[in-house]
């Protein structure tokens, strides 16, 4: 006979990600033993919340709690019930309710209230629901790639915990109401506001990050359907043969499109617009959306924002993979340079609608903005963020790394549940339970 | 070819309680939610509410709770639908309907694809 | 809880006609889907996300809207259209169905 260990006992964390568009909730799993580890913290499952974001419901917040709860049944399912009492559970909202927020106060707080009355009902430890800023969204999602790609520490064969010589991933977020680009940087930030230090096991950390609102892919589209509206009279990123009827009301309700906003309008008003499958007049359209006039700082993004120039690898995902993704394997056009990736925009503002829907069989669903979302993409990554093609050729566009979704919701776990502590690890021994 | 198999018709007195059943054949059963949605005589249709087939979650429409409970048996690739303290307003068509999807930039977006045939249920003493 | 108001509630077509049928909310919705039932059978899906086109469905039958304003439009009528339509939301729960449009043929 022979011992056999029986494997740790896990524990569990919850997070809903309250986005602009849609909810998902991750459940995260760990073992009780290990921790402080990095790396060791795994997606155990997820669930995609019907309907819109919490945010669309700022008339109706009861009916945002009602549709978490499929969801949250499933994580009564998911969870080990002797793991119920003691896992924590958080929802973080996004750019959606930040919006909300700033035209909208009470109805935030309202759609905040119900929803902590709904998750307050289930067994788990709750420990709140709130809205994150920018800032937060950005560096939470630095944090969740850099964990799961184990850049902070790793177990060396000798058994020590050793910092890998490799240094840490940029991470870039494109969300439906906002973009976050965040980077480990050496020299201070100009602005204070987008500079966050971090002490992450035993290791300073002088990160650049800044939250973009209103450049989420659906805002974007918003404005650029304004842009369309009061410009042309029809829509040049959408494809030749497809129209559509388009509620002004709709168009201009977001703080987003108030700068484009007719000052007499009827917001009952439709207006039939149509596509023209015009690459460059797209192009245009999209980078009207970009300022570059003036800049208080020694160096910019766009719209007078300080960056310092990208450096190092950087990780894109959720729009920014999806986008790409889309024209890789979709469209089957090759993307690994920039020129390559505004070859594939240009290609795909050009289809027809019956080209489009021809060569897309299967996934029409909104496949109209594509053509805008490839455009505004490769126009952020090249104008706003000052990718060249040699800093363009670190970047991946990636959903999950080691089976978990990349995005705020992990890195946001570890920090509140002090996963990551601040001081480095003593010497351990690692115990294989294979 | 999918298939929602749902049976004619049941006449219950009023205050009783009926169970009707959907038969899936054609796809993975526990692949899809299964939804219930009511047609009242000459009236439009009502969402009562869904069940995860996977982990036995269930989601009602609020005017539904209490009325509705649904159920499977993965075995057999059936939902269920129980209805109590049946009223005259209770008497319609109750549909069974398997829930689509697509993505979209990683969203899910979701519809009713196929349908049962429908079962009637006439509350009557 | 979204409200949705089809109209007409019955529309008289002759065969050959282009037509419209249409689906107000009460509130924004990010997309509508389209049901067709036909007399004494279950609901057929026809057009999901506002427009697009379910699988069999003829090319004569298109969707467009946005906002609170949805539309179905049949180009060119034909028999086998007569029949009940209904506009259908999944924005925000709890899920809704207009009261319908029954499209006759003269």
């Known amino acids: 006979t022979r011992d056999v260990r029986e494997p740790p006992a896990l524990k569990y964390g919850i997070v809903l990600d309250a986005g602009s568009s849609h909810t998902s909730m991750f459940i995260y799993k760990w073992p009780a033993d290990k921790e402080n580890d990095t790396g060791i913290v795994g997606q155990h499952s997820s669930c995609d919340v019907p309907g819109g974001g919490i945010s669309s419901y700022a008339d109706n917040p009861s009916g945002a709690s009602q549709s978490l709860v499929g969801c949250l049944e499933q994580a009564l399912q998911d969870v080990p019930k002797e793991r119920h009492a003691g896992t924590p559970l958080y929802l973080g909202a996004t750019a959606g309710m930040r919006l909300l927020n700033l035209t909208n106060p009470e109805a935030s707080t309202s759609v905040l209230m119900a929803v902590t009355h709904t998750l307050t009902q289930y067994p788990f430890d709750f420990r709140g629901a709130r809205i994150l800023s920018g800032q937060e969204e950005g560096v939470f999602g630095w944090v969740t790639a850099n964990y799961l790609l184990e850049n902070f520490i790793k177990y060396g064969w000798v058994g020590r915990w050793f910092r890998p010589r490799k240094g840490t991933l940029g991470a870039m977020d494109l969300g439906g109401a906002s973009t976050q680009i965040t980077f480990e940087t050496t020299s201070p930030a100009e602005d204070r506001a987008s500079e966050v230090q971090l002490h992450l096991y035993g290791q300073h950390y002088r990160v650049y990050t800044h939250s973009f609102l209103c450049y989420g892919r659906d805002q974007v589209l918003q404005r650029l359907l304004a842009s369309a509206l009061q410009t042309h009279g029809f829509h040049p990123c959408w494809p030749r043969g497809f129209s559509t009827q388009v509620l002004l009301g709709d168009v201009y309700q977001s703080p987003c499109t108030m700068a484009q906003r007719p000052q007499n309008f009827n917001s009952s008003a439709r207006v039939s617009l149509s596509g023209s499958s015009d690459p460059h007049l797209c192009r245009d359209l999209v980078s009207g959306l970009f300022s570059f006039s003036s800049c208080p700082f020694s160096r910019c993004s766009f719209n007078g924002v300080f960056q310092p120039p990208v450096a190092g690898n950087f990780v894109a995902f959720s729009a920014f993979f999806y986008t790409v993704d889309f024209l890789r394997t979709s469209m089957g056009l090759p993307v690994a340079t920039l020129q390559q990736l505004e070859a594939a925009a240009v290609n795909v503002c050009n289809q027809t609608w019956a080209q489009l829907q021809a060569r897309v069989p299967g996934q029409r669903a909104r496949l109209a903005d594509y053509c805008a979302g490839a455009m505004f993409v490769q126009q952020l990554l090249s104008r706003g963020y000052g990718f060249d093609e040699r800093a363009f050729g670190g970047v991946i566009f990636q959903k999950k790394a080691a089976d978990t979704a990349v995005g705020w919701a992990l890195g946001y776990m570890l920090n509140l549940t002090n996963l990551i502590p601040a001081d480095p690890p003593g010497l351990r021994k690692g115990t294989d339970f294979s | 070819e999918v298939q929602l198999q749902q049976f004619g018709a049941e006449l219950v007195k009023p205050g009783a309680s009926v169970k009707i059943s959907c038969k899936a054949s054609?796809?993975?059963?526990?692949?899809?939610?299964m939804d219930w949605v009511k047609q009242s005589h000459g009236k439009s249709l009502e969402w009562i509410g869904d069940i995860n087939p996977n982990y036995d979650i269930t989601s009602y429409n609020q005017k539904f709770k209490g009325k509705a409970t649904l159920t499977v048996d993965k075995s057999s690739s059936t939902a269920y639908m129980e209805l109590r303290s049946l009223t005259s307003e209770d008497t319609a068509v109750y549909y069974c309907a398997r829930r689509g999807f697509f993505l979209y930039y990683g969203s899910s977006y979701y519809y009713f694809d196929v349908w049962g045939a429908g079962t009637t249920v006439t509350v009557s003493s | 809880q979204i409200v949705l108001t089809q109209s007409p509630a019955i529309m008289s077509a002759s065969l050959g006609e282009e037509i419209t049928l249409t689906c107000s909310a009460s509130s924004s919705v990010s997309y509508m889907h389209w049901y067709q039932q036909k007399s004494g059978t279950s609901p057929k899906l026809l057009i999901y996300s506002t427009s697009n086109l379910a699988s069999g469905v003829p090319s004569r039958f298109s969707g467009s809207g946005s906002g609170t304003f949805y539309s179905l439009t049949i180009s060119s009528v034909e028999a086998e259209d007569a029949a009940d339509y209904y506009c259908?939301?999944?924005?925000?729960?709890?899920?809704?169905f207009g009261g319908g449009t029954k499209l006759e043929i003269k």
């Open positions: 054609g796809y993975t059963f526990t692949d899809y939610n």
């Open positions: 259908h939301q999944w924005s925000s729960y709890p899920w809704t």
